[in-house]
């Protein structure tokens, strides 16, 4: 199709070298036809479209992403060709930065159902570039956490080192949908619930005597609770002996609950122990089994092939740590009868 | 691999300590074992250290060898040597954590006792 | 106290013979046995592990069976390279248990 009519758009996206980063493109349609898709109409009632209602559909999934090849080839399907960038709904995702993702990306409806909607497609040029500016080292981060229950804020990365007076004027989106009342570099949050945990994205405008484009970072925003002050506790084993059959295969569990920690390093480990040594043994990856915002239950299981004699002298031990200290549980194996 | 080093001619009673260096491979994961073979004669056990640290020593060397590690190397103190202590000194890797067959072995160092 | 007796001290045999090597333990060690082979002015190099299993890159040639207390390791289709001092190994539970034999001299005629 002839992308000559679509309105286009410019965006930089400068990413940090040092910490993990995502980026996203709304499908800016015109407005009328916005609304029919991705359900961000920014238009007021009283405001008039500059183009002819688009007659798309109620669908929010009915958008076809493209890039354009700088090599004037044509126009690639996002989905086909580029595994680290993911559509959901009407934004495209970047998970992973990097100046390879400059280009042209062009949305569209995947259904055209009216004269008009020939021309209803957008067309991105997206910039990618690394930070360099050393001078602003203590940048927001690109992942931020609230604690629940009090106050916080939410900074735009790419501002976080100008003040409120000399920022410019900021478009807030959360999960894709336009904040309308932000319009500074930094949310402020009175008290944090957890629906305030999202993907926040700021924009904001930036110009030179040539051409204006838009800045965009994306924040991600996890509600926390405060850090615990207990060391982890072990659910399982309970007992500290344990009834087994000679010759068989046996699974012992060991389950602990770890309250929440920002900085989390879990620690899981399976020792045997007889009269004379201590050692780790060496046993599957442990896995989360149930995660809530205050804790988080893992468990990690020893396997032994078949139950010895040699195992009935020994202490099979389950040692957990966090932050705060660790905790043990011993299980003595000991031969059923009967 | 596995490589001892430090073995050397000494007086009676002057402490020792031989090095054991490895490589391609973590001291977390495995245990190490030290093994020693006079001049003609047969393999005999000294001591264990495990992946978590841990020490067990043959009844006949407790109190005279100590062992420790780093992260790369595992060390055989001999604190007070007699001329009985001549022998080529092993340090092997255990094929686990704990008690376990040995593989692979260093090529051994030399230690000669002696007035 | 534990013991790991291994019998011949010595044994010959022709080339392309079969030789058997024995290894008594005073107690059962439950198949905790390992069987080292040992040239001169080198390391002994692991053969066999759990009394039976064969190590990475050991010829199949090398045999190790038995249970309990009493151990084989057979070395079948002898070559001059099988020219060595052979050493059953137990690991079976904590240090009393965590000896050599005292060796075997195989010799190639």
């Known amino acids: 199709f002839n992308i000559s009519g679509c309105s286009t758009k410019k965006l930089l996206w400068t990413y940090s070298t040092r910490s993990e980063e995502e980026f996203v493109l709304f499908c800016d349609l015109p407005e009328p036809q916005k609304s029919h898709f991705c359900h961000r109409n920014r238009l007021s009632p009283k405001q008039v479209p500059e183009h002819l209602p688009f007659m798309g559909s109620n669908d929010l999934s009915d958008v076809q992403w493209y890039q354009q090849p700088s090599n004037g080839d044509p126009l690639e399907d996002i989905r086909k060709s580029y595994p680290h960038i993911i559509q959901d709904k009407c934004t495209l995702h970047f998970l992973t930065p990097g100046v390879n993702n400059s280009g042209s990306y062009i949305c569209r409806p995947k259904m055209i159902k009216s004269p008009y909607d020939v021309a209803c497609c957008v067309k991105m040029i997206l910039e990618v570039k690394p930070q360099t500016n050393a001078s602003c080292e203590y940048s927001a981060s690109h992942k931020q956490d609230l604690l629940l229950g009090s106050t916080g804020s939410i900074s735009c990365p790419s501002l976080s080192c100008q003040s409120d007076a000399q920022s410019p004027a900021v478009t807030w989106y959360k999960n894709g949908k336009l904040l309308s009342v932000e319009r500074s570099n930094r949310i402020v949050v009175d008290e944090v619930y957890d629906y305030h945990q999202g993907t926040y994205v700021c924009d904001y405008t930036q110009s030179d005597t040539v051409s204006s484009w838009t800045v965009r970072a994306v924040v991600q925003v996890r509600t926390i609770v405060g850090d615990t002050k207990l060391k982890p506790d072990i659910l399982d084993p309970v007992e500290d002996t344990l009834e087994v059959e000679l010759g068989k295969p046996l699974t012992i569990s060991c389950k602990a609950r770890f309250g929440f920690e920002r900085v989390f390093n879990p620690v899981i480990k399976w020792y045997i122990k007889d009269s004379d040594l201590e050692w780790e043994v060496s046993v599957p990856e442990a896995k989360s089994i149930k995660s809530t915002l205050k804790d988080e239950i893992i468990e990690r299981n020893i396997i032994l092939e078949k139950v010895t004699q040699r195992d009935l002298r020994r202490k099979f031990v389950c040692f957990v740590q966090n932050s705060i200290g660790n905790t043990t549980q011993s299980v003595q194996l000991k031969e059923k009868r009967g | 691999s596995v490589e001892e080093s430090g073995g050397r001619l000494v007086t009676p009673g002057t402490p020792l300590t031989l090095t054991c260096t490895v490589s391609?491979?973590?001291?977390?994961?495995?245990?190490m074992t030290w093994v020693r073979q006079a001049p003609g004669k047969g393999l005999e056990w000294i001591g264990i250290i495990s992946n978590s640290g841990a020490t067990a020593y043959a009844s006949w060397a407790k109190g005279r060898f100590t062992i420790s590690k780093t992260s790369t190397t595992v060390d055989l103190k001999i604190t007070t040597p007699t001329t009985e202590d001549t022998a080529t000194y092993f340090c092997?890797?255990?094929?686990?954590?704990?008690?376990?067959?040995?593989?692979?072995w260093g090529p051994g160092t030399l230690v000669t006792v002696s007035s | 106290a534990f013991e790991l007796t291994q019998t011949p001290s010595s044994v010959s045999a022709a080339v392309g013979g079969t030789v058997t090597i024995n290894c008594q333990a005073s107690?059962?060690?439950?198949?905790?046995l390992a069987w080292y082979q040992q040239k001169p002015g080198q390391p002994p190099k692991l053969l066999i592990y759990s009394a039976s299993t064969l190590a990475s890159g050991v010829s199949s040639r090398f045999k190790g069976s038995g249970s309990g207390t009493e151990y084989t390791l057979t070395i079948s289709d002898l070559g001059c390279a099988d020219a060595a001092t052979y050493y059953c190994q137990s690991y079976y539970d904590g240090a009393v248990t965590f000896t050599f034999g005292g060796g075997t001299e195989v010799v190639v005629k």
């Open positions: 092997a890797r255990g094929r686990s954590g704990g008690w376990d067959a040995l593989d692979p």
């Open positions: 107690e059962d060690i439950e198949n905790y």
């Open positions: 391609g491979f973590s001291l977390t994961t495995y245990a």
